[in-house]
Interface confidence: low
């Protein structure tokens, strides 16, 4: 049994880091493998993560970390029984993937303006709370070419757009994701999408 693709990990900078890797053949990750992780300098006995299957030869492990600070550095040991398959390290603050925003809502009753709001996925005492910016994706269910991205570079989790910038009388979907420049994070996963019917009064034609 060998590791084909070494573990790569990302942290949500709150409570979970996720590590993924591939074995050289079909593996029952949860019964055959264990990922041990320890905080360098400040260690107790290792914490053990039981991996799950992620495709035939792929494994994924969710490491529980009750909090994260920028100085934290973890050692990682991947074991198959008594055999050490791989040894590495992971600094969560250097590999951050924010949590996805939630509660995306489209308010359509504001005078021909669409107001999209969502929730910041972090509590106020988390460092990322005041450092997230967002991308909102809006697309038409009827027209695959009608696909647009709005960058929200201010802190407020909301976006206003004129309903008239979208086609009237058809259904649209929206989703939102987040990133934080301060830690040069990757983008979060997209939030669940929300659907609405876009309708607005066309202005009277001028003759």
């Amino acid at each position: 049994m060998k590791v084909l693709q070494e573990p790569t990990c990302v942290s949500d900078y709150m409570s979970i880091s996720t590590c993924e890797w591939k074995m050289n053949g079909p593996t029952n990750c949860s019964t055959e493998l264990r990922l041990l992780y320890q905080l360098v300098f400040l260690l107790s006995e290792a914490h053990t993560c039981i991996p799950e299957n992620n495709g035939g030869a792929g494994c994924v492990c969710h490491l529980l970390m009750d909090d994260v600070v920028s100085a934290d550095n973890y050692t990682l040991d991947l074991w198959a029984g008594q055999q050490l398959l791989w040894k590495g390290s992971f600094k969560p603050s250097e590999h951050v993937k924010p949590r996805a925003p939630g509660n995306l809502t489209v308010h359509t009753n504001v005078s021909d303006t669409l107001l999209l709001t969502w929730s910041n996925p972090y509590p106020p005492d988390n460092y990322l709370y005041n450092h997230l910016t967002y991308a909102v994706n809006i697309w038409s269910e009827n027209d695959p070419a009608d696909f647009r991205i709005y960058n929200v570079t201010y802190l407020e989790p909301s976006l206003r757009i004129a309903a008239s910038t979208l086609k009237s009388g058809i259904s649209y979907r929206a989703r939102v994701r987040a990133w934080a420049q301060c830690y040069n994070t990757t983008w979060s996963e997209w939030s669940p999408s929300t659907k609405w019917h876009n309708s607005y009064r066309e202005p009277f034609e001028q003759h």
């Epitope: 905080l39 107790s44 006995e45 920028s70």
Partner: antibody, heavy 122, light 107 residues
């Protein structure tokens, strides 16, 4: 209950060396990160050094880096601080501390020894 | 390094009074701040960790609050045994640092 007993303090001339020891009992010593913290007479607390549970990783305050070495012998449940090139400003009570595990991190000090006084004077 | 500034340096109060101690960090430490109590001739004792969590065996009259750069330790009603020096400490970044201390003395 947890017990930490420091020894090895005393009066030493500037530039000389001293080794402090800390005998630990009442907990699984080999599973804990351990620290030294010092306190100059009438002054506040200053963190000095940390060593990981297995002795493979150490970290130091800038004021002692290159002069002090933290080490441990898990078979003897003992923590050490080797202090070289001592200066007058190293005069302090040196505390051996066990850190409490909160969220897997070991940086809050829940157990302290009684301290041992190191005086650097000519 | 993160500098912790405690104020006031000395607090003169009577038993039964409320004590409010402040600790300000030179940069954000999130909630990674602890408070210790030290009596003359004794080693420090952990009171509060992660800004607001009481350590084992610490009476409910001790409470901590704050996040980011501003933190407060409150003793709701001073008992005679509470007159001591109090230190804050951060673990957000290396090196670990302590504040200069606040002495709570009997008025």
């Amino acid at each position: 209950q947890v017990q930490l007993v420091e020894s090895g303090g005393g009066v030493v001339q500037p530039g000389r060396s001293l080794r402090l020891s800390c005998a630990a009992s009442g907990f699984t010593f080999s599973s804990n990160g351990m620290h030294w913290v010092r306190q100059a007479p009438g002054k506040g607390l200053e963190w000095v050094a940390v060593i990981s549970y297995d002795g493979n990783n150490q970290y130091y305050a800038d004021s002692v880096k290159g002069r002090f070495t933290i080490s441990r012998d898990n078979s003897k449940n003992t923590l050490y601080l080797q202090m070289n090139s001592l200066r007058a400003e190293d005069t302090a009570v040196y505390y051996c501390t066990k850190a409490i595990s909160i969220s897997g991190t070991y940086n809050w000090f829940d157990s302290w020894g009684q301290g041992t006084l190191v005086t650097v004077s000519s | 390094e993160i500098v912790l500034t405690q104020s006031p340096a000395t607090l003169s109060l009577s038993p039964g009074e409320r004590a409010t101690l402040s600790c300000r960090a030179s940069q954000s430490v999130s909630r990674y701040l602890a408070w210790y109590q030290q009596k003359p001739g004794q080693a420090p004792r952990l009171l509060i960790y992660d800004a607001s969590n009481r350590a084992t065996g610490i009476p409910a009259r001790f409470s901590g609050s704050g996040s980011g750069t501003d933190f407060t330790l409150t003793i709701s009603s001073l008992e005679p045994e509470d007159f001591a020096v109090y230190y804050c400490q951060q673990r957000s970044n290396w090196p670990l640092t302590f504040g200069g201390g606040t002495k709570v003395e009997i008025k």
